[in-house]
Interface confidence: medium
């Protein structure tokens, strides 16, 4: 059974992940971002179901495409400190949260999504899990 300390750790990790995803989304949604039109043309895969931590497998599988899109979108008015580091940090958190005991085959929805919809989906996921923990 999960202890209060492990629950607290999970909560902190989810909050960190949430902040990272929100930071990316805020950068993208910045009205001064001249690359938004182009970024919105890259389609991301969305999870059919995302209700448990193990479903973060679906986010993990989309981190490489996310990194590439963010790299391509860098401009004077949209600049993330270090995309590689940021994605690497997200990856570490995701791996810890989802655990490695069970290897889940991610099931994707038929509909694809823009980067904004993709990020919003995973932000909602984090918020939902955090609320159950608190």
């Amino acid at each position: 059974a999960p202890t209060s300390s492990s629950t607290k750790k999970t909560q902190l990790q989810l909050e960190h992940l949430l902040l990272d995803l929100q930071m990316i989304l805020n950068g993208i949604n910045n009205y001064k971002n001249p690359k938004l039109t182009r970024m919105l043309t890259f389609k991301f895969y969305m999870p059919k179901k995302a209700t448990e931590l193990r479903h973060l497998q679906c986010l993990e599988e989309e981190l490489k495409p996310l990194e590439e899109v963010l790299n391509l979108a860098q401009s004077k008015s949209f600049h993330l400190r270090d995309t590689k580091d940021l994605i690497s940090n997200i990856n570490v958190i995701v791996l810890e949260l989802k655990g490695s005991e069970t290897t889940l085959m991610c099931e994707y929805a038929d509909e694809t999504a823009t980067i904004v919809e993709f990020l919003n989906r995973w932000i909602t996921f984090c918020q939902s899990i955090i609320s159950t923990l608190t």
């Epitope: 039109t37 182009r38 890259f42 389609k43 391509l72 401009s75 694809t112």
Partner: antibody, heavy 124, light 107 residues
Framework: EVQLVQSGAEVKKPGESLKISCKGS????????IGWVRQMPGKGLEWMGI????????KYSPSFQGQVTISADKSISTAYLQWSSLKASDTAMYYC?????????????????WGQGTAVTVSS | DIQMTQSPSSLSASVGDRVTITCQAS??????LNWYQQKPGKAPKFLIY???NLETGVPSRFSGSGSGTDFFFTISNLQPEDIATYFC?????????FGPGTKVDIK
């Protein structure tokens, strides 16, 4: 080999309808935007619009919005361009082209693979 | 819509010459500019993306440069097979507009 094969030349009368096709092969058709480009006789290239076959998301140039319909059938890896009522001014060569991509998915960086073109002649 | 202009509209040069075509955008498009080659009766061919990146398999005598609103396309050593019309295209903002083209032929 990645390729786009278009349907054959068409000769139509003003007011008739028409649907031309573009079949993709050699790559994951659902993951790449397909664009349509018009070239009137002796003229330059005009970007008409694009479709993402994976979810049928479609974007039109304002010049062509309402004039044509772009669609796709992902089950047969085919994109379409159609007119409900042709005009003489629709006489042109129409090309379909794939937008290149990264991570095995489309992210506009130019149209890297082109169909051979479909000549459409509208004359009474 | 972003307007694209090209100059010259046509040019004639000798085999071995260095040829440069200019493309101008009506607003800043960063480096989101592509170049295509179209030979008579054929479909366009993709040459350069993002202003200066050569598409795989394109001869190194072709090159591109520029950013913002001003772009350049150069053929460093003109060959007979380079006789074609060259088009620039912006893909920074929808709709993705083409330049009117520059026709290149041999003297």
């Amino acid at each position: 080999e990645v390729q786009l094969v278009q349907s054959g030349a068409e000769v139509k009368k003003p007011g008739e309808s028409l649907k031309i096709s573009c079949k993709g092969s050699g790559y994951r058709f659902t993951n790449y935007w397909i664009g349509w480009v018009r070239q009137m006789p002796g003229k330059g290239l005009e970007w008409m619009g694009i479709i993402y076959p994976g979810d049928s998301d479609t974007k039109y140039s304002p010049s062509f919005q309402g004039q044509v319909t772009i669609s796709a059938d992902k089950s047969i890896s085919t994109a379409y361009l159609q007119w409900s009522s042709l005009k003489a001014s629709d006489t042109a060569m129409y090309y379909c082209a794939r937008h290149g991509g990264y991570s095995g998915r489309s992210y506009y960086y130019g149209m890297d693979v082109w169909g051979q073109g479909t000549a459409v002649t509208v004359s009474s | 819509d972003i307007q694209m202009t090209q100059s010259p509209s046509s040019l004639s040069a000798s085999v071995g010459d260095r040829v440069t075509i200019t493309c101008q955008a009506s607003q800043d498009i960063s480096n989101y500019l592509n170049w295509y080659q179209q030979k008579p009766g054929k479909a366009p061919k993709f040459l350069i993306y993002d202003a200066s990146n050569l598409e795989t398999g394109v001869p190194s005598r072709f090159s591109g440069s520029g950013s913002g609103t001003d772009f350049f396309f150069t053929i460093s050593n003109l060959q007979p097979e380079d006789i074609a019309t060259y088009f620039c295209q912006q893909d920074d903002n929808l709709p993705f507009t083409f330049g009117p083209g520059t026709k290149v032929d041999i003297k």
